[in-house]
Amino acid sequence: EPPTACREKQYLINSQCCSLCQPGQKLVSDCTEFTETECLPCGESEFLDTWNRETHCHQHKYCDPNLGLRVQQKGTSETDTICTCEEGWHCTSEACESCVLHRSCSPGFGVKQIATGVSDTICEPCPVGFFSNVSSAFEKCHPWTSCETKDLVVQQAGTNKTDVVCGPQDRLR
């Protein structure tokens, strides 16, 4: 009786179970009464990452420098190229098909997590006792200056955007 199902890494065709091609190879000819499946290696800049019966290999992804992309990991016959973004940029999606400039944290906000090639800057509001007076992709919120440790007094209260202003203590005459 012809099979109705095949083992793992096989496929059913013309009532026969044929071996799939291994990763890195494409199908040329299905197996026959006389021959095993005929497979050929993928060419330069091509890949197949699964056991397959594909007659064409996939093209490696192109990391387009015009889109801010660069190669993070070169593709092989079994893996696709992995792109990442140039310094100061990050991917717009998981597939990393294009890049955007890292966002900066506005005054009053500090960097909670510095951006990577695949994730944007994460900002957080400066809590009481901290400030940021610049727009930056790297600067965290800085603590207000402690006037007391300098033997000074607060002359102007700090905000989330400004540091405190210290001044000399009033002398009793």
């Epitope: 013309n14 040329v28 000819s29 299905d30 026959t32 006389f34 021959t35 095993e36 005929e38 050929l40």
Partner: antibody, heavy 113, light 112 residues
Framework: QVQLQESGPGLVKPSETLSITCTVS????????VYWIRQPPGKGPEWMGM???????DYSTSLKSRLTISKDTSKSQVSLKMSSLTAADTAVYYC???????WGQGTLVTVSS | ELQLTQSPLSLPVTLGQPASISCRSS???????????LHWYLQRPGQSPRLLIY???NRFSGVPDRFSGSGSGTDFTLKISRVEAEDVGVYYC?????????FGGGTKLEIK
Amino acid sequence: QVQLQESGPGLVKPSETLSITCTVSGFSLSRYSVYWIRQPPGKGPEWMGMMWGGGSTDYSTSLKSRLTISKDTSKSQVSLKMSSLTAADTAVYYCVRTDGDYWGQGTLVTVSS
Amino acid sequence: ELQLTQSPLSLPVTLGQPASISCRSSQSLASSQGNTYLHWYLQRPGQSPRLLIYKVSNRFSGVPDRFSGSGSGTDFTLKISRVEAEDVGVYYCSQSTHVPWTFGGGTKLEIK
């Protein structure tokens, strides 16, 4: 439907080179392999060699040194060339597809002066 | 080069009686992927060989079920349960596991 047809010279002189073409229809030579069989009068069949779908070739050990199999996929043709012929090469030559039971009708080649 | 040895060379059979042909290989015909590419052909007088059985025991389409194949490794058998007049001819075993592919020397079946 699937068809294979050999065309050969019929008569060849000893020491000359034999050229036979197998023209196929109903399938592509880039997806199917074809092999050559010959059968001398009153004897059993002999496998000569094959052309794989991917373009590689395999040859009979005894014929390897004087046999070349090639193909032109665009013309749907597989060619057999065999040099230094002797009377022992007189046979019916068949091209066969490597699945099912698809044979050409065969072409008789006689090697004689 | 792999040798296929068939026996007997000649097989006279009475119509309606069973027949059996043996094919022995000089090395195992099991492929690396677990398939055994041993086949049986019948060549009737004046015709090209016709495939009967492929991969040891699979009847080719249109082949009567009185033909059956069996065996493994190096020993294989073709059986005809009840011989009919149209079964006359030369039977060849053939292997396509190892390059070069090879044929057995043939067994001539004739009616007694």
